[in-house]
C-alpha cells in the first residue's frame, strides 16, 4: 500500500520581501526519499524542476531554487510539489513574493512584511486543480507582471 505523502512546505531566504535586483532562494521541504522537487508559480505555465535534493534533517529533505536578480516580474505566489516514487505529493500552500523598489522615496515604507508571514493560507486545491495555474520558472527571459486569473 502506498504511503500518504505529507504536503511540502515552502519558504524564502532571506525573506518574502526582496529589493529589486537582489537575490532570493525558495526552499522546498518534504520527507526523505524525494526524487524531484518542482517549483510552480501561480498564473504561469512554466516551472522549475530539480533533482538536487539534500537532507535537511533525519526526517526531511529539501531543494533550493535561487533567483539571482529579482525583477518586478518575479513577484507573486509560488508553491512546491515533490515526487517520491511512485507518486507526486499534494502542493504546498502558496508563498507570496513581494518585490520592492530600492530607491525608496518619501512615500515608500521602510519596512514590509517579511518571511515570518509564511505561506499564504489559501484553501487546498481540489484534486483537479494541480495546475492552478503553474509557475513561470526562474529564467531571466520569463519576466511578466503578475496577474490573477481566478
Amino acid at each position: 500500500q502506498e504511503e500518504d505523502l505529507p504536503r511540502p512546505s515552502i519558504s524564502a531566504e532571506p525573506g518574502t520581501v526582496i529589493p529589486l535586483g537582489s537575490h532570493v532562494t525558495f526552499v522546498c521541504r518534504g520527507p526523505v526519499g524525494v526524487q524531484t522537487f518542482r517549483l510552480e508559480r501561480e498564473s504561469r505555465s512554466t516551472y522549475n524542476d530539480t533533482e538536487d535534493v539534500s537532507q535537511a534533517s533525519p526526517s526531511e529533505s529539501e531543494a533550493r531554487f535561487r533567483i539571482d536578480s529579482v525583477s518586478e516580474g518575479n513577484a507573486g505566489p509560488y508553491r512546491c510539489i515533490y515526487y517520491k516514487p511512485p507518486k507526486w505529493s499534494e502542493q504546498s500552500d502558496y508563498l507570496e513574493l513581494l518585490v520592492k523598489e530600492t530607491s525608496g522615496g518619501p512615500d515608500s515604507p521602510d519596512t514590509e512584511p517579511g518571511s515570518s508571514a509564511g505561506p499564504t493560507q489559501r484553501p487546498s486545491d481540489n484534486s483537479h486543480n494541480e495546475h492552478a495555474p503553474a509557475s513561470q520558472g526562474l529564467k531571466a527571459e520569463h519576466l511578466y507582471h503578475h496577474h490573477h486569473h481566478h
Epitope: T46, Y47, H131, P133, A134, Y144
Partner: antibody, heavy 116, light 111 residues
Framework: QSVKESGGRLVTPGTPLTLTCTAS????????IQWVRQAPGKGLEYIGA?????YTYYASWAKGRVTISRTSTTVDLKMTSPTTEDTATYFC?????????????WGPGTLVTISS | ELVLTQTPASVSAAVGGTVTIKCQAS??????FAWYQQKPGQSPKLLIY???KLASGVPPRFKGSGSGTEFTLTISDLECADAATYYC?????????????FGGGTEVVVK
Amino acid sequence: QSVKESGGRLVTPGTPLTLTCTASGFSLYKYNIQWVRQAPGKGLEYIGASTYAGYTYYASWAKGRVTISRTSTTVDLKMTSPTTEDTATYFCARHIDGDYSGYALWGPGTLVTISS
Amino acid sequence: ELVLTQTPASVSAAVGGTVTIKCQASQSIGTWFAWYQQKPGQSPKLLIYGPSKLASGVPPRFKGSGSGTEFTLTISDLECADAATYYCQSTYFGVDYLGGTFGGGTEVVVK
C-alpha cells in the same frame, strides 16, 4: 526522446478500443500527456490529458466516451463505445521541458476506423 | 467551456511577404497558449509557446505575442515551406478547468 501511439485499427461501432501512447527516452512521471485527434480533412480536436501528477482532464464532448489512464511508461486512451464519428488519426503529445503550455513531442499518430 | 476563435480561416501571401493570424480566447488564459504548424500527412509541430517563446529549431521569422485573451502569430519573410495549416491551442489547467481547446485552424497559402 519520443512518444508513439499504437492500437489503431478497424472496428465496428460499439466495440471498445484502447490506444496506447508509449514514452521512450524520458521519465514519463514528469510530464503531461495529451490526446488529440484529427478526422480526415478536419482540424485538430482536443480529447483530454493525463497530467504529471496523475490527474485526468477531458474535453466536454469526450466525458463518458473515453477514459485516460497511465502507467510508468504508457498513457492509454480507452474508447468505450465508438461510433463512426470517431474515425480519425489519434495523436499523443508530451509537453515541453519547463513549460506546460506547449507540446513539442508528438507521435506519428495511429489511425482508428469505425465502420460496420 | 473555453472557445478559441482563430482568424482568418485561410490567407494567401507571396514569398517574402508577411502573414498575421489571430486567436481570441473566450476567457483569460494567461500564458497557457501555443501555436502549431501542421502539413498534410504529418504530426503537428510546436512553433511558439508561453505564448511568445520560440520552440527549438523554429526560425525567428515566426513571432508570437499576446496574453490573456488576445494572441497573434506573425510569419515574416514567407517561404514556400511555410505553406501549412496553423493552429492555436490553450493548455490551461486552472481553478476553473479551461482545458486544451484548439482553434479552428488557418490555412496559409504561399504564392
